[in-house]
């Protein structure tokens, strides 16, 4: 029977009975938050061989193995995982070892098995027979090994039972418990799972079988299942589902899971069933079951139940995630804000269309709506009073609205009103008339030619840029000296540059009012000689990579009315020189016969340049009398090598540590202080266990159920 | 794989309250789907009575909402029907079902409570 | 609440040859999404109804392909193409288009 579409048992062990005939969960197992310690030795649930998603026990109190429970768990496929892991222990205070005896597969996903004080026989199970890769894992914080006495079954009476393999050096018995082997198939089986007997499965069986060569009775499938047997795709008119069995179109079209309510239902796409159309995919229809390529971005509708959605913060920005289609009207309302248009830029940057109106108001730290980057429709179904679907009023640093050589922007029905923005341009506002086809709908009151622009240069000159000077790390630049018609009105220039891979950065990009900018700026003081053209070092730049680089005049902003004349370049985009790449990574060399060495390394991290070709430069070396004074047949650890540059390996003492005489001074030998790469390493090792303790307990604990 | 199963008293007083459990084996009631109690009086055709969803919510035929009450037990994994005041008119064969976006998929087989004194 | 009226209610038939069976709703059941959640049951005796047709003309995986539906917006039809003896029963259609759902009378189908 398959059970799902994930279990989740908490508070009382009775429910454990929910899994009395299920032998393939679909979806996850939960057992946690049990605090009263139970008899768990009635319960057992042999027919249970496959969970299709992840495993994790938390806070059960009174269990202390799971092999009685799970006696025939065989894989756990990690078709979805929990932060990355399909089996985790976390806080099993009595767990005294896991127990799991015919599990065989992990196919997706790591294992985190932490804070289990009383948690034995870790060691003696080997991962990387259950797993792909073992590198991912996570056991910490358990009973310390060697309070643990771990013996496989057989030690004591020397007639070991189980089999051997090599984990980290150490060649030893596997097992899950006193009385049970880890189980290994003959090396003649290869990749192929085995019976109890060690006869070989079908290539399309997983974990185990109840007959050799047999489809039909694999314990779990390697790619499929379908009517009994394990396949190695879905068959015609039917689609794979959950990642493990092939399931028809009207199952697909009638599932109405809790997880996908919301949409329209779940879809058949590329031969599988899935919730939704994947990334770069729309439905082929508002009800329809198939999917059809994007064109561009795939439109999302995103729809606001009071009609008006409010953004005054990043948070409520966040909701419109992935939105290209508002329908409702959008009122802008950022008086602070950290990195906030890089922010608003991340969350509301697909949206292109809006059907209402858009408000900008009271948003004194914004800049520019260039966050806004892909609008290009507003439809303004529904109008402000005044019949404005577009408003901006009382922004004290807008200084664009976005740059009209690269954007095209339609306002379909409404006016536009522009209201008390003293740094932002009138000509800006009659660029965007023209731009959006409003032109002719505003009268005279709409666009305040008075208190718009009333603080900034409007007027622009062009300033030119006489000459750029490249090294490897430096750009020296000049430009004309700007001559206002009147000289006191300038004070200094302002140098903006920033690295610019492509050349389609615009003044405005993640700039906001309140300190955060992606340009670093540098003043430029006047050359007190007025014929000395005005110019700058930018130092301490990467070699070999394009920067943007413009310059602003910096003037007196008004002379009573009178808009004043400002000046700045156009964007400058330069090169610096090339420079000698850092080293090569990751150099690995083996032999691979007497007279032939294989050497391989990756890229630099920095190229700094065009790379044309490496230099291998070798050199033979004389052979070390040192390594043949040693009996490599005896047990003792192989010495220590020493190598030329007075380095040595440090060997980790494990019995009876001797006190050496160091540094001339008699006394033991102190450890070395921690490096810093080996503080930073513990540091971010004690964030993430913090990082995972915060997603396990928000994603188990939930309201109580009515 | 996903089975249900009607039980409960087989015969109510007429004015008492008729009381039904659907254990629900394979599938957790509160992981998706819409799950309906239906009825057919002997002879007759098929009546929906209402259902529980996913999330709790209920959803009655107008004509019995004042006499009809939907709930579970989601630590059991089943989901019950009372209905009230009963007479002799709500003599059925009640059967529990499971309705997804489309369609019913899955039925129990049906239990007859028969109402008289 | 949307009346579902089938008609005939009883249908003797001679296997092998067609059979017909109508359903009318009382008022346009094309739910607001454009389905159109009109279902149709074969009840054979002493069993639980089995689903045939979803959304008036899907016809259920391993239902045999001598079963159709088709219709739309009031007016619904189910045709069996050639009658088997294992055909009989009573067949229902239902929507599921708006709450209250509602079943049809039923349509009785016995060999003659």
């Known amino acids: 029977e398959i059970c799902g579409p994930g279990i989740d048992i908490r508070n009382d062990y009775q429910q454990l009975k929910r899994l009395e005939n299920c032998t393939v969960i679909e979806g996850y197992l939960h057992i946690l938050l049990i605090s009263k310690a139970e008899d768990y030795r009635s319960y057992r649930f042999p027919k249970l061989t496959v969970i299709t998603e992840y495993l994790l026990l938390f806070r059960v109190a009174g269990l202390e193995s799971l092999g009685d429970l799970f006696p025939n768990l065989t894989v756990i496929r990690g078709w979805k995982l929990f932060y990355n892991y399909a089996l985790v222990i976390f806080e099993m205070t009595n767990l005294k070892d896991i127990g799991l005896y015919n599990l065989r597969n992990i196919t997706r996903g790591a294992i985190r098995i932490e804070k289990n004080a009383d948690l034995c026989y870790l060691s003696t199970v080997d991962w990387s027979l259950i797993l792909d890769a073992v590198s991912n894992n996570y056991i910490v914080g358990n009973k310390p090994p060697k309070e643990c006495g771990d013996l496989c079954p057989g030690t004591m009476e020397e007639k070991p039972m189980c089999e051997k393999t090599t984990i980290n050096n150490e060649y030893n018995y596997r097992c899950w418990t006193t009385n049970r082997c880890q189980k290994m198939c003959p090396s003649t089986c290869g990749k192929r799972a085995c019976t109890e007997n060690n006869e070989c499965c079908h290539p399309e069986c997983l974990g185990s079988c109840s007959a050799p060569d047999n489809d039909t009775a694999c314990v779990a499938c390697r790619h499929y299942y379908y009517a009994g047997v394990c396949v190695p795709a879905c068959p015609p008119n039917t689609y794979r589902f959950e990642g493990w069995r092939c399931v028809d179109r009207d199952f697909c079209a009638n599932i109405l899971s809790a997880e996908s309510s919301d949409s329209e239902g779940f879809v058949i796409h590329d031969g599988e069933c899935m919730q939704e159309c994947p990334s770069g995919f729309i439905r082929n229809g508002s009800q329809s079951m198939y999917c059809i390529p994007c064109e561009g971005p795939c439109p999302k509708v995103c729809e606001e139940e009071k009609k008006t959605k409010t953004i005054d913060s990043v948070t409520s920005a966040q909701m419109l995630q992935g939105c290209t289609i508002f329908k409702g009207n959008l009122l802008i309302n950022i008086r602070r804000g950290n990195n906030i248009a890089s922010e608003l830029e991340n969350f509301m940057g697909l949206i292109e269309v809006v059907t209402g109106y858009v408000k900008i108001r009271h948003s004194h730290a914004l800049v520019s709506l260039s966050f806004l980057k892909n609008l290009r429709l507003i439809l303004g179904e529904e109008q402000l009073e005044g019949n404005y679907s577009f408003y901006v009023l009382d922004n004290q640093n807008l200084q664009q609205l976005w740059d009209w050589d690269h954007r095209n922007l339609t306002i379909k029905a409404g006016k536009m009103y522009f209201a008390f923005n003293p740094k932002l341009c009138v000509s800006e506002i009659y660029r965007m008339e023209e731009v959006t086809g409003t032109k002719g709908r505003q009268s005279k009151g709409d666009i305040n030619t008075r208190n718009n622009g009333e603080r900034a240069s409007c007027e622009s000159d062009v300033l030119h840029f006489t000459s750029t000077t490249t090294s490897k790390n430096r750009i020296i630049i000049t430009w004309h000296r700007y001559r206002p018609p009147d000289y006191r009105d300038l004070i200094s220039f302002t140098v903006y540059y920033k690295e610019a891979p492509f050349k389609n950065v615009t003044e405005y990009d993640g700039q906001d009012a309140c300190g955060s900018n992606s340009w670093n700026m540098v003043d430029v003081d006047l050359p007190p000689n007025k014929d000395v053209e005005p110019g700058i070092l930018l130092h301490g730049l990467k070699p070999w990579t394009q920067y943007a680089v413009y310059v602003k005049a910096v003037t007196l902003t008004m002379v009573e009315n009178d808009h004043i004349r400002g000046a700045k370049s156009e964007i400058l985009y330069i090169r610096t020189n090339a420079s000698v790449p850092s080293i090569p990574l990751d150099v690995l060399s083996a032999s691979n016969s007497s007279s032939q060495l294989i050497v391989k390394w990756n890229p630099p991290s920095l190229p700094n340049g065009n790379l044309s070709y490496y230099i291998v430069r070798w050199q033979r070396q004389p052979q070390d009398g040192y390594l043949y004074r040693h009996n490599y047949c005896s047990k003792d650890k192989i010495p220590i090598r020493k190598y030329a540059d007075g380095t040595i390996d440090i060997e980790e003492v494990t019995e009876n540590p001797k006190t050496e005489v160091c540094g001339g001074e008699k006394g033991p030998c102190c450890a070395c202080p921690k490096t810093e790469a080996e503080k930073q390493a513990e540091k971010e090792e004690a964030e993430y266990r913090k990082v995972f303790e915060n997603f396990l307990h928000n994603s188990i604990f939930v309201p109580r159920p009515e | 794989q996903v089975q249900l199963q009607e039980s409960g008293p087989g015969l109510v007083k007429p004015s008492e309250t008729l009381s039904l459990t659907c254990t629900v084996s394979?599938?957790?009631?509160?992981?998706?789907?819409?799950w309906n109690w239906i009825r057919q009086p002997p002879g007759k055709g098929l009546e929906w009575i209402g259902y529980?969803?996913?999330?709790?919510?209920?959803n009655y035929k107008p004509s019995l909402k004042d006499r009809v009450t939907i709930s579970r037990d989601t630590s059991k994994n089943q989901f019950s029907l009372k209905l009230s005041s009963v007479t002799a008119a709500d003599t059925a064969v009640y059967y529990c079902?499971?309705?997804?976006?489309?369609?019913?998929?899955?039925w129990g087989q049906g239990t007859l409570v028969t109402v008289s004194s | 609440d949307i009346v579902m009226t089938q008609s005939p209610l009883s249908l003797p038939v001679t296997p092998g040859e067609p059979a017909s069976i109508s359903c009318r709703s009382s008022?346009?059941?094309?739910?607001?999404?454009?389905?159109?959640?009109l279902q149709w049951y074969l009840q054979k005796p002493g069993q639980s109804p089995q689903l045939l047709i979803y959304?008036?003309?899907n016809r259920l995986y391993g239902v045999p392909d001598r079963f159709s539906g088709s219709g739309s917006g009031t007016d619904f039809t189910l045709k069996i193409s050639r009658v088997e003896a294992e055909d009989v029963g009573v067949y229902y259609c239902?929507?599921?288009?708006?709450?209250?759902?509602?079943f049809g009378q039923g349509t009785k189908v016995e060999i003659k």
């Open positions: 079902a499971r309705y997804g976006r489309v369609f019913h998929d899955y």
């Open positions: 394979g599938y957790s009631i509160t992981g998706g789907y819409l």
């Open positions: 529980i969803s996913y999330d709790g919510t209920n």
């Open positions: 008022q346009s059941i094309v739910h607001s999404n454009g389905n159109t959640y």
């Open positions: 959304k008036v003309s």
């Open positions: 239902f929507q599921g288009s708006h709450v209250p759902w509602t």
